[in-house]
């Protein structure tokens, strides 16, 4: 049994998340995850799910009763989702921590928008000239 | 030239994001995107970046001076990042809109945690027995 299971059960007790009424009105994450089979689609969704859990854990980080459980689960997420790659985790954390109401952050984000957009589709990974031809092709052919 | 370029330039004017000082203290997104070449890693990062821009655009949605620009860019993101797939966009939006301070949402999230964790690594897509063997191997080799 993976280490997170026992700790997740502990969190369930703490949050009364084992009660039958918790399942009312559908799931938060599970139905969405079932919709997406392609690895890249799953990563888009899991990225949001993981950032949700990190925020949730942050809100309860000072509660001694669940501190060990939270730390074990975070460590397991780091192994499973970030492949124990600290740089990947650090980059992810940076992105989740930017404040959308900070005017300097807003200006930077808008400044970078054109380059971010240019890289959004998988086609963006090939060389510039080839890409522009391909995307014209996409615009004209898909 | 892709249609978003002109509209992004308009946003730059609006936010004074063309000023030389905007580049001070490094980039928000571009350096991070340069770090990740694997498609699934890129999707993890782009998922956070796209949700940032959507939040930013939401904050300025009633400003007539940039409304057309924002709508064009959002449409372009939907074509490029979500492949014009509204179901993908809808699932993404649901995930970004959950409130981490809502106690019902918290309980649901903790209730689903074990199953979410079980699916976090790409190995999770193969059969259960095979996965447990493979994951022992992964944990020992990473």
């Amino acid at each position: 049994q993976d280490p997170y299971v026992k700790e997740a059960e502990n969190l369930k007790k703490y949050f009364n998340a084992g009660d039958p009424d918790v399942a009312d009105n559908g799931t938060l994450f599970l139905d969405i995850l079932r919709n997406w089979k392609e690895e890249s689609d799953r990563k888009i969704m899991q990225s949001q799910i993981v950032s949700f859990y990190f925020k949730l854990f942050k809100n309860f980080k000072d509660d001694q009763r669940i501190q060990k459980s939270v730390e074990t689960i975070k460590e397991d997420i780091n192994v499973k989702f970030f492949n124990s790659n600290k740089k990947k985790r650090d980059d992810f954390e940076k992105l989740t921590n930017y404040s959308v109401t900070d005017s300097n952050v807003q200006r930077k984000a808008v400044h970078e928008l054109i380059q971010v957009m240019a890289e959004l589709s998988p086609a963006a990974k090939i060389g510039k000239r080839k890409r522009s031809q391909m995307f014209r092709g996409r615009r004209a052919s898909q | 030239q892709d249609p978003y370029v002109k509209e992004a330039e308009n946003l730059k004017k609006y936010f004074n994001a063309g000023d030389p000082d905007v580049a001070d203290n490094g980039t928000l997104f571009l350096d991070i995107l340069r770090n990740w070449k694997e498609e699934s890693d890129r999707k993890i990062m782009q998922s956070q970046i796209v949700s940032f821009y959507f939040k930013l655009f939401k904050n300025f949605k009633d400003d007539q001076r940039i409304q057309k620009s924002v709508e064009t860019i959002k449409e372009d993101i939907n074509v490029k990042f979500f492949n014009s797939n509204k179901k993908k966009r809808d699932d993404f939006e649901k995930l970004t809109n959950y409130s981490v301070t809502d106690s019902n949402v918290q309980r649901k999230a903790v209730h689903e945690l074990i199953q979410v964790m079980a699916e976090l690594s790409p190995a999770a897509k193969i059969g259960k027995r095979k996965r447990s063997q493979m994951f022992r191997g992964r944990r020992a080799s990473q």
Partner: antibody, heavy 124, light 111 residues
């Protein structure tokens, strides 16, 4: 009230070209994708092409790519389908259909509003 | 090669319930929305279900839509069948980037 009105159909010879038009009203035209869907006499529905709203990206059915070109004029609430090298099997009723507003996460349904169609007959 | 396969014809008596299936040949049915259209002779298609299970305004609750990932199919159910329901029904979904896909259509006969 949302309305889509197609025009420009008619009888043409094999190998000829033809452009059919669609004029829309009752909604913010530039926000919406527009589809062309055709139906041969007594047959099912076949998607032909789509053009996005403000970005004007074009998407085509694999079987028709190269012969058909979709375009739009947002200032005049109009969409066009230019068809070249026409064949007998292109004979059909061509429908103009409103798609999603992809800039709005609460967009009305895709393919909810249809025109009445314009008939294109390809025959020698 | 993506296909949506429907039965050619379905029939039922007034007041009864019929189900029209729409099987997706490849790709996951759950990864794209499914719509259903009713087409009466001489008329343009009219939507009866959008985004898997939602009804446009004016469509009675006798019409319902569902998606089953295990069979990779969508279904349109019409209960309390009426003579006016006699028509052709088409399912529709997507593949790739905005590629629209229609099923072959099902002729519903009310006996």
């Amino acid at each position: 009230e949302v309305q889509l009105v197609e025009s420009g159909g008619g009888l043409v010879k094999p190998g000829d070209s033809l452009t059919v038009s669609c004029v829309a009203s009752g909604f913010t035209f530039s926000n919406y994708f527009i589809h062309w869907v055709r139906q041969a006499p007594g047959k099912g529905l076949e998607w032909v092409a789509t053009i996005s709203g403000r970005t004007k990206y074009m998407f085509y059915s694999d079987s028709l790519r190269g012969r058909f070109t979709v375009s739009r004029d947002n200032a005049n609430n109009s969409v066009y389908l230019h068809m070249s090298s026409l064949r007998g099997e292109d004979t059909a009723l061509y429908y103009c259909v409103r798609g999603y507003d992809h800039s709005d996460s609460n967009s009305a349904a895709d393919l909810l509003h249809w025109g009445r169609g314009t008939l294109v007959t390809v025959s020698s | 090669n993506f296909m949506l396969t429907q039965p050619l014809s379905v029939s039922g008596y007034p007041g009864k319930t019929i189900v029209i299936s729409c099987v997706r040949s490849s790709g996951s049915v759950a990864s794209h929305y499914v719509q259903w259209f009713q087409q009466r002779p001489g008329s343009a298609p009219a939507m009866v279900i959008y985004e898997d299970s939602h009804r446009p305004s004016g469509i009675p609750d006798r019409f319902s839509g569902s998606v089953d990932a295990s069979s990779n199919s969508a279904s349109l159910t019409i209960s309390g069948l009426k003579t006016e329901d006699e028509a052709d029904y088409f399912c529709q979904s997507y593949y790739g980037n905005n590629q629209v896909l229609f099923g072959g259509g099902t002729k519903l006969t009310v006996l």
